[in-house]
Interface confidence: low
């Protein structure tokens, strides 16, 4: 057949859906690849065609839109499953074409099973709540477009396996779940189950997200350099290994990029000729405050190296700080020699 602009398999959009639940999947062409929307394409005489490759198969085949209960259907640029089955897993392709134009993209769809406590291989979105910050809400995600606004679904919220009712500081409010004052004990997986009727049938949408209680911006401070500091002097002899840790504490800040780096004589280590290695480790507190440690290492230090300026720098959205390490060459200890006079002896 004639050439088609093939965008390949769009693995960035790995779609996961639960078994036996409705799923609506928009053709990614209009969202990420083409500069026009479905309506424009449709009015220009372009047709959207769907097909798929089953899991562990190479054969592309048309999607069966003739299943009982209209289980799989297409509406504009959306592929509908009402509901999904486990063996719907595979790579789906949407192709937009007419006699002169063709463009297509494939994407993976994985239908996953969940247990009675909503555990599954599903990758969960994480919602961060500030600790002791006042009322904050999470909203049941990705339920738009499944039912008209005239339909009033029932929504049940769970924390882990337990239905949320009479929880101290967590209140279900329809599609929202409100946290009065979030505490570390509120960390966990929260699930909303949305139940709605459609043409005499009842459907369920299950959406789970992870809540992580993090440091409040009220308590955020600029980076704090714990090491190097004024109390520690790195005294080395030429030929010894020089190890200087730079340890920095960062308050949690939403979407802040935390950076730590060393300069040697005002230059980045990569820009100078000495043999330096830098190893970084990162640890987090329960509220996601971060401690970064970068250890600067020179295996065999020279007397020139011991005269250089070693400065640790740190930056976050709250500010930038720097601290120089105190490095010096060890002064050799004086040699005490004892000369014994001759001629003393017993006669």
């Amino acid at each position: 057949s004639e050439r088609c602009d093939d965008w390949g398999l769009d693995t960035m959009r790995q779609i996961q859906v639960f078994e036996d639940e409705p799923a609506r999947i928009k053709c990614p062409l209009f969202e990420h690849f083409l500069k026009f929307n479905y309506s424009t394409a449709h009015s220009a005489g372009l047709t959207l065609i769907w097909y798929w490759t089953r899991q562990d198969r190479d054969l592309e085949e048309p999607i069966n839109f003739r299943l009982p209960e209209n289980r799989i259907s297409k509406e504009k640029d959306v592929l509908w499953f009402r509901p999904t089955l486990l063996n719907d897993t595979g790579n789906y392709t949407c192709m937009l074409r007419n006699t002169t134009y063709c463009s297509k993209v494939a994407f993976p769809l994985e239908v996953v099973q969940k247990d009675s406590c909503f555990n599954s291989p599903m990758k969960l979105p994480v919602h961060k709540l500030y600790i002791e910050y006042g009322i904050q809400r999470i909203t049941c995600p990705n339920v738009d477009g499944y039912f008209p606004s005239s339909v009033k679904p029932t929504i049940t919220w769970y924390m882990g396996c337990y239905k949320i009712q009479n929880f101290n500081n967590v209140i279900p409010e329809g599609m929202n779940l409100s946290f009065l004052i979030a505490l570390i004990s509120n960390n966990g997986n929260y699930t909303c189950v949305v139940t709605y009727p459609e043409n005499g049938r009842t459907f369920h949408l299950t959406r789970t997200l992870t809540v992580k209680v993090v440091g409040s911006p009220k308590n955020a401070v600029p980076p704090v350099i714990h090491s190097p500091n004024d109390h520690v002097v790195y005294e080395k002899e030429p030929g010894e290994e020089l190890l200087i840790p730079c340890t920095v504490y960062f308050s949690f800040l939403m979407d802040s990029r935390n950076e730590v780096w060393w300069t040697i004589d005002g230059k980045k280590p990569d820009d100078i000729t000495i043999d330096v290695t830098i190893n970084e480790s990162i640890s987090h507190s329960r509220t996601e405050d971060e401690t970064r440690t970068q250890i600067l290492s020179i295996k065999k230090v020279t007397s020139e190296d011991l005269k250089r300026s070693y400065v640790c720098h740190a930056r976050s959205a709250k500010g930038e700080v720097a601290k120089a390490a105190k490095v010096k060459q060890k002064v050799p200890a004086p040699r005490y020699t004892v000369e014994l006079a001759c001629g003393f002896g017993a006669t």
Epitope: F65, R66, P68, E69, S73, R82, N199, G200
Partner: antibody, heavy 113, light 110 residues
Framework: SVEESGGRLVTPGTPLTLTCTVS????????INWVRQAPGKGLEWIGY??????TYCASWAKGRFTISKTSSTTVDLKITSLTTEDTATYFC??????????WGQGTLVTVSS | AQVLTQTASSVSATVGGTVTISCQSS????????LSWYQQKPGQPPKLLIY???TLASGVPLRFSGSGSGTQFTLTISGVQSDDAATYYC??????????FGGGTEVVVK
């Protein structure tokens, strides 16, 4: 609910149309099956009409049986040239979640000379 | 064409006892689980008991259970009651979009 009508006593060779009337069911997104049961015998699937008016029939029923949607609330089963073998109670049933979950009471068709 | 076989045409049960009815399909049902069970009493339409092999239909007592996958399925009635006297049918739905019914098993409660 679903309700069948149109069953009666007919002579062999006569055509007959049975009607399934639904209420509270949207035929644009719900399928309707026809099933029959000869006196004292088991259930026999005839066919199905789904969303988009797509019809499926059992291989034995093709040709002589036609299923069609006649309004937003009715589905017809047309049988041409009835034989005594077609004597049965004819049920219509909605496709539920992978099964026929809502049945009518049935309508009796008797073919006799 | 698919053939659904219910080996026993009739089984006898005592009140409080357990009955199992088997259903074998000549080929795998759709998604390996599109097998349903129906109860029919004389003069009445069939009533859905179990769908997708093991899911209990709304309002059906817990003493009914279904199991199986692919081609072999079982309906179990635990703690049989006199009201369970009826004929039970299995039905399979297939990739070909056909529906097949088993021949039925009559449960006689003594």
């Amino acid at each position: 609910s679903v309700e069948e009508s149109g069953g009666r006593l007919v002579t062999p060779g006569t055509p007959l149309t049975l009607t399934c009337t639904v209420s509270g069911i949207d035929l644009n997104s719900n399928g309707i099956n026809w099933v029959r049961q000869a006196p004292g015998k088991g259930l026999e699937w005839i066919g199905y009409i789904g969303a988009g008016d797509i019809t499926y029939c059992a291989s034995w029923a093709k040709g002589r049986f036609t299923i069609s949607k006649t309004s937003s609330t009715t589905v017809d089963l047309k049988i041409t040239s009835l034989t005594t073998e077609d004597t049965a109670t004819y049920f219509c049933a909605r496709w539920g979640p992978g099964a026929l979950d809502l049945w009518g009471q049935g309508t009796l068709v008797t073919v006799s000379s | 064409a698919q053939v659904l076989t219910q080996t026993a045409s009739s089984v006898s049960a005592t009140v409080g006892g357990t009955v199992t009815i088997s259903c074998q399909s000549s080929q795998s049902v759709y998604n390996n689980n599109y097998l349903s069970w129906y109860q029919q009493k004389p003069g009445q339409p069939p009533k859905l008991l179990i769908y997708k092999a093991s899911t209990l239909a709304s309002g059906v007592p817990l003493r009914f259970s279904g199991s199986g996958s692919g081609t072999q399925f079982t309906l179990t009635i635990s703690g049989v009651q006199s009201d369970d006297a009826a004929t039970y049918y299995c039905a399979g739905f297939y990739e070909t979009t056909d529906v097949g019914f088993g021949g039925g098993t009559e449960v006689v409660v003594k």
